[in-house]
Structure formats: C-alpha cells, structure tokens
C-alpha cells in the first residue's frame, strides 16, 4: 500500500496512457482521478516527489521526480491539468514498455552510485492504461528491472516489497485484464488493480490504496468511503451524557482534541455533577470512557449576570473533559484540529512560520464562512452546513439574540453576545440548519484542504427548532446559533493542553 508517513520519503510516478484506444473522455476521467489522488495524499501532510508521464507511441515526461517543484502538489496538479489527449495524436500507438522505461530512468541514478537515503524511499507507480500495448515488447520486463534496481524480493530477511507498489487502473472502452493484472503488484490482502467502475467512487479506491498507520494521530482527517461508518466520517465526535438521579439526563456532544481530552461546552455540566455520572463515548463504541476530571473555563459563570436580569450567561462556555486512560487512535477515533497549533498549520499546508493571526485570517476571514456541525438524527451522525456570519451580516446575526427566551429585556445585546461568540443561522446567504439541544458542546468546523478544523464550540440557540428531537422544517429568520470562538479562549486551551504535544503557536 501507499504508506503515508509524514517523516518518510516517497516517489509517486503517474503514468497515463494517451493512445488511440483510450479515448478523450476516458483520458480526462483518468486525469481527474490522478488529480484527486494527489490531493488525497497531500491532505496527509506528506510531500512525495511526483513523476508525470503520458505516452502513446512515445512517452512524454511532464514532471521529473528530480525537479525542485515535483513535491509541490499544487504545481504538479497544474501540470497535469494542462495535459491534453491531443498531445499524442500524431503517434498514437501503445508502447507501455517505453513509458515504464521512462519511469526507470527517473528512478535510476548516474554512474550506478545511489544517493544517500535511496534505500528509504518508497516508490509508487500508478499506471492508467487499457493494457492493449501493441509495440515495444512486454512491459513486464521493465517492472522486473525496477524491482532489481530497488533490490526488491532479493533479500530473504528484508524483501523490501513495501518499497514498490504498482497500481494499474484499467481505463478505456476495452481493457485487457490479463495484461493489467500482470503489471500490478501482487501482495496479500491488497488490491492493486482497479477498473473504470471503481473510479466512480474514488474514496473507496483510495481506501484500498492508502496505508495511514503512520499518520493516525493527524488531526482533522476523515474517510468518506462507502463502507465507512459515521465515525469514519467524523472520527473526533464524542457523545456525552450526564446522569442526574431524579432529574433524568443531559445529552451533549464533544470533540476529541488529543489522546486525553475531549472539548465540549461547560453548560453541559453543573458543579454538582460527579465524574462517575458523566458518560463519554467515542468512535461509535458502546463502552463509556472513564473520566478523571472536567475542567471549566475559569471565566464561565452561567449565573454571572442574574442580577442584571440575564437568567443565563454563556460567555466562555467551554470545558475540557480529561480522560483517565489514553485513547487509542484509529480510523474511527482521531482528533480534530485546533486553531493555532502546528498540526493545523500543516493541515492547511501553510508555511511553518505561519502565525496564529495568519491562521485566524485563513479560517475566520471577515465574511460569510462556510462551516459545518455534526448532529445526531435518528441514531445517525449527519453533517449540517452553515455559514458563520463574520462579515457584514455579523451585526444582524448577533442582534437576533434578543429573541432568545429571557433576553428580551436586554438593552445592549453585547451584554449577552460577547466577543467570544461566533454566530450562525438565519436565511442569508442560505437557510442554515439549526442546532438542537443535544448538539451542545459539539464542534463548529471549517473544512479546508481536505481537513477539518474546529473553530467553535456549540453553545446556545435563539429558537428551539427541535421539538421532540425532530428538526422543524419552517424556522424563523431570527433562529440563530451561538458558538464559543476558539481563537478567543486560546490561552486557556494552551494551558490545559500543554502536555498534549499539540504544538500551540
């Protein structure tokens, strides 16, 4: 499989058959698949060097792995997008052997003197062809030469099979399955041959191709493949429930932010709640996690403005649940990214020198910001797309707080909507879905560059649009939701999560 190890070295060779038998639309589809693959790999913070070859009678090398920009995913994607099917129109035979020899030439080194670290570089060949080679001879001989060059299958104790993966995608109206199978790697419990039909569900294909065992701790990563559970798609999501004898129970959500901590809303708990009465589950697992302590933001005080006629005051409505035992990350349990951390810098593919302010400008610019939250409906987790009103609609969004029960007497809305809040909901630019009571504490998320970054914690809403846990279809325009802006509680997060190796900026 493609081992996505951010600390490893990898060369990926994209080889695309542009011969007569492929056809223009299949060629375009194959290109799109490769563009998606480049993006998927880049989302892991991995920077492989790419080689890019198209071929028919002759190969054309568009990107050499030795080029400085070959590890720049955006640049490689640009080169790929600029390739036309017509480029091989005049010489349109199919010489797969010559194309693979072009790959071999990129892999090999001058004077047979291997460079430092050559034996730690993994090589992945992704060949898109119909397998109908009609000139140049059998391409399998080049695969054998490549195996020889990379010393694969020669040392009984160290066969190095994981240093070469050959994936073959059958494209075109007619595919010679025998030829395609012969070229692809054969490894136990792995799939290296894919058909055109598979390309309709690329996430499923990538799931078969990628080994992410070295990057399970990466924040904000998800799998969207069809066989995936709700928690493959939202692996950070935590369900919280507080059992209060004779008073029923309170349900909330939270987000895994590290191996020991779940971030949620402070109002989910009272000072009287004992740790043993708080149930937290992650990854869709039935068992509850043992809790060591709940840490409230020191400035949170729901009764802080009672004297001023404000019955409930949600400023600084954040809490961290510290778990007794370390979480074991996997595909259904992994952390969400937090603002102003090194992990988020990498997730957004920003330079290492990026400041907290620059992250803020990237994630929360002064405009309507597309975001999402995760809600549970009929036992299923679903993503709800909303817009954070952070530009010219911010004021009107915040003013709608006056329609909230108990806030109608508030003279100055900034008394309840402090600078700590982000506002969503309403009907402009689109009709936003609203949060329900059970969504409290869950993350407000910005999805960027295939990664998920938490920017807020769901706190309170103006209108209860979820009678009997069913979302009402028709809701008033003033149905707004307020979320604690994580950029505003960073000192507290940094202090409490200082031992979690998140690399706060």
């Amino acid at each position: 499989k493609i081992v996505l190890d951010p600390s490893g070295s990898m060369n990926i060779y994209l080889v695309l058959d542009g011969s007569d038998s492929i056809g223009a639309s299949n060629f375009t589809g194959a290109k799109k698949c490769l563009v998606n693959l480049i993006e998927k790999v880049a989302s892991y913070g991995v920077k492989p060097r790419y080689g890019l070859v198209t071929y028919a009678t002759y190969p054309k090398i568009w990107v050499k792995v030795s080029e400085a920009d070959s590890s720049n995913a955006d640049w490689v994607t640009k080169q790929l997008n600029e390739i036309n099917y017509e480029d091989h129109k005049l010489k349109s035979g199919t010489n797969t052997k010559k194309a693979l020899q072009a790959v071999y030439s990129m892999m090999s080194w001058p004077d047979d003197v291997p460079p430092e670290g050559w034996n730690r570089t993994r090589h992945v060949i992704i060949l898109m062809t119909d397998g109908l080679h009609n000139m140049g001879g059998d391409p399998i001989t080049v695969i054998d030469e490549i195996r020889d060059l990379l010393y694969i299958g020669k040392d009984r104790k160290n066969p190095r099979e994981d240093y070469l993966d050959v994936y073959v995608f059958g494209v075109g109206p007619l595919v010679n399955q025998v030829n395609i199978n012969a070229l692809a790697s054969k490894k136990d419990n792995e799939q290296h041959v894919f058909k055109v039909k598979d390309m309709e569900n690329l996430e499923d294909v990538f799931y078969q191709m990628i080994d992410e065992s070295q990057s399970l701790s990466l924040c904000g990563m998800v799998w969207e493949h069809r066989k995936g559970t709700d928690y493959h798609k939202q692996p950070w999501q935590a369900k919280i429930s507080v059992i209060r004898p004779s008073k029923g129970h309170e349900s909330c959500m939270g987000a895994v932010v590290s191996e020991y901590f779940v971030l949620t809303a402070a109002h989910c708990f009272t000072v009287d709640d004992k740790e043993h009465s708080i149930k937290v589950s992650v990854g869709g697992e039935k068992r509850d996690l043992e809790i060591e302590v709940v840490l409230f933001h020191p400035n949170y005080n729901i009764n802080g403005k009672k004297e001023a006629g404000i019955p409930e005051f949600y400023d600084y409505d954040v809490a961290l649940i510290k778990l007794k035992n370390k979480l074991k990350y996997g595909q259904t349990i992994r952390p969400i990214c937090l603002p102003c951390t090194e992990g988020t810098t990498r997730a957004l593919r920003l330079p290492p020198t990026t400041t907290c302010q620059q992250q803020k400008e990237e994630l929360l610019p002064a405009q309507d910001i597309k975001a999402l939250f995760v809600s549970e409906e009929e036992k299923k987790l679903t993503r709800k797309e909303v817009y954070i009103k952070n530009g010219d609609k911010k004021g009107s969004c915040e003013r709608d707080a006056q329609y909230a029960p108990g806030y109608d007497k508030v003279k100055d809305i900034s008394e309840v909507v402090t600078p700590r809040f982000l506002c969503t909901g309403g009907v402009s630019p689109y009709a936003d879905p609203n949060t329900c009571r059970g969504d409290s504490g869950g993350p407000l998320i910005v999805h960027k560059r295939s990664r998920f970054i938490q920017v807020g914690v769901i706190s309170w809403g103006v209108v209860d649009v979820c009678k009997n846990q069913k979302r009402q279809k028709q809701v008033p325009a003033h149905a707004r939701d307020f979320h604690i802006n994580l950029f505003q509680v960073l000192p507290w997060l940094k202090e409490k999560l200082q031992d979690e190796d998140l690399g706060f900026l």
């Epitope: 291997p114 034996n119 010393y151 040392d155 009984r156 160290n158 190095r160």
Partner: antibody, heavy 121, light 111 residues
Framework: EVQLVESGGGLVQPGGSLRLSCATS????????MSWVRQAPGKGLEWLGF??????????EYAASVKGRFTISRDNSKNTLYLQMNSLKTEDTAVYYC????????????WGQGTLVTVSS | EIVLTQSPATLSLSPGERATLSCKAS??????????MNWYQQKPGQAPRLLIY???NLESGIPARFSGSGSGTDFTLTISSLEPEDGATYYC?????????FGQGTKLEIK
Amino acid sequence: EVQLVESGGGLVQPGGSLRLSCATSGFTFRDYYMSWVRQAPGKGLEWLGFSRHRVYGYTPEYAASVKGRFTISRDNSKNTLYLQMNSLKTEDTAVYYCARDNPGYYAMDYWGQGTLVTVSS
Amino acid sequence: EIVLTQSPATLSLSPGERATLSCKASQSVDYDGDSYMNWYQQKPGQAPRLLIYAASNLESGIPARFSGSGSGTDFTLTISSLEPEDGATYYCQQSNADPYTFGQGTKLEIK
C-alpha cells in the same frame, strides 16, 4: 559463470600487515553480501566477517576474534572485495577464503580457491 | 554468539549406508518462518561447497541423496545412500544472527 579469485597471501612477520583481494566476476557484485572465512591448518572453518549489500550501504560486520584488527572493504567499480589485516599474530596463519553470501537464502553459495597467509618470524 | 555443536566428530560408514549428521545450536536460528542453517562439504585441499541452505533446501547441482531437516535448535544432514566420493568433512553454519558461526565439523570416512 560466477568466479571468485583471492590473492595477496604470503609470509608475514607477527605484528605486520597484509591486504588480501578477492576479484569477482559473473554476477552483480553490489547486490551480494561478501564474506571472508579462514581455516587454520588442520582446523575447522572460522567466519571472519562480511560486507553487506547495497541496501545496507555495504556496511561490514566482524567476528569478535578479528574486530579492530581486520577491515573488510569493497570496490564495486572493480567488483573486488578486500581484507586488510593489521597486527597479525601467529594464530592468524590460515587459508583465507572469500565467499559470495547469497541474500536470497543467507548462505555462502560460491567460494574462492583460498589464499594462504603464514604469520611467522 | 550462537554456538553450533556437531556430532559425531567422526563417522565411518560403508558405501550404500545411510549417514546422519547432527548439529545443535545454543539458541534458535529461526526467523520469520525460516531456519537459517546451512550445510557445507569440504574435501582436503579444496574450498567448501554449499550443500543445503535454509535447513532443508538442496543447492542446485547437489545430488538428491543429500537432504536436510530440522528447525529451531536441532538440525540434521542426511546422506541416504553413501557414495565413495562423499568422504569429506561436513560443516553446519548459522546465518540467522551476526556474527555467523560454523560448527566444528563432522569427518565422514567411507570404509
């Protein structure tokens, strides 16, 4: 056809030095471990060390009895293996063999004819 | 290091007889499902010759009367029906752990 030919043996005084060579042909030299083995007169075989193949950067490994005194090296451009022997002792008297160590099964599948080293005053 | 002990030290048998040579290792020479034990034959004045690799695999060009068996610490070289030219010294050698080591040898005499 695989061939290994040792040279450089002879008479040397205790404390002296000698460099043995093993010229090879008929196979891709850099892809193999290469070992040195010796046999004292009337005694059994003693493995001295090897030079690993290219994946391991040709790094050497030595038997405890010669570590620090003997050095194994190779010149891949000449397909030749070397054994540099310093601070020689009378007990180093032996026939010295070089052998190709096949990493496909970690056995010495081809041997040279051997070269005699006599350490005596 | 792994010490290999061969027995018997010498063996005297007639042509056509079966020879069984033993080699015991001070610790296991198995790794990842393979036994890294090899057997060599050496005739006087000649270089050793590989007979068996990885405990039981016959090297190409070696007569089928030679066979190897065993795993872990106990290994056997068997010559099913002795020929006069089989008179030689036989060495076992482990290549599982560095440093490699040889047994002290078993001298096989053909009567």
